[in-house]
Amino acid sequence: GSERTCCPVNWVEHERSCYWFSRSGKAWADADNYCRLEDAHLVVVTSWEEQKFVQHHIGPVNTWMGLHDQNGPWKWVDGTDYETGFKNWRPEQPDDWYGHGLGGGEDCAHFTDDGRWNDDVCQRPYRWVCETELDKASQEPPLL
């Protein structure tokens, strides 16, 4: 069948999800495309526990996540509700800063060197994390 019962090679399993950590950079949209081509999505952080797991693997490096406000409100790429969900912004972030001189504000979220989140110019070539959930069907206990 098409169910994903275990993580692909070079992906890391954690709490019924699979994670892939890039070692090169891409703009946010290109990173998003990359994850989709892996039948995955940019990482969606839903808990402090998941935040710590991702932070441990990426180290002190700017890294894209699946959160953006390119169309107005902040949205997670998998539809997870932003308003009621987990957040870990740096103080005074997001600030949609226009002072970078690159045109426009800051519409894409990334992990900073201390793991807390910042909004930044989506064209910056940061590393990224892909995530895909193991299929619910595979989580059911086997029939005896």
């Epitope: 098409s2 994903r4 692909p8 090679v9 070079n10 090169s24 950079g25 891409k26 703009a27 949209a29 290109d30 495309n33 990359y34 989709r36 081509l37 892996e38 039948d39 070539p125």
Partner: antibody
Amino acid sequence: EVQLLESGGGLVQPGGSLRLSCAASGFTFNSYAMSWVRQAPGKGLEWVSVISGRGGTTYYADSVKGRFTISRDNSKNTLYLQMNSLRAEDTAVYYCAKRTPSDAFDIWGQGTMVTVSS
Amino acid sequence: DIQMTQSPSSVSVSVGDRVTITCRASQDISDWLAWYQQRPGKAPKLLIYAASSLESGVPSRFSGSGSGTDFTLTISSLQPEDFATYYCQQANSFPFTFGPGTKVDIK
């Protein structure tokens, strides 16, 4: 042995349709994104389309968008390219290729020739 | 779209010569670059990925370098089977694009 084998090429009139197939063997087909790349006679390589391993995501070159459709049948280990509204400039050898995590193509088929002419 | 250029477009060399082919991207692509060899009437063959990583089974006389916009493929000592056309490909963003190719032929 890892292998890709294209078929389905031929002569077709402008405005016509053709479906190319690519039979894969020797690797876990549904674990890899697959692509089509073409080469017009005496010209360079042009990327056409790519599809994710489970078929949920596709991307196309602007030159074929809306006319070509990439698909796959993982139960048959086969990749397809449905080509509609064909034009003379679509004349080329069409290769299927296996994508790597670095977005390069490490395995290529032998190619199938598509000629669009009246 | 990202445009890829290659130079030279062709080069005539002798067996044993060192050959250097350059590839330039119209914008920064980090190390998202691959090199291919294509012999007449054959499918392309992957030589280098991620700008400098040698594909399994490819002879060590092939090497790649560069990052950002400027990249180089080097063949340290050309062998008879290396006479072919070489293409670079950017893998940074869709649509993936190839350089126009560099033909390496016998002097």
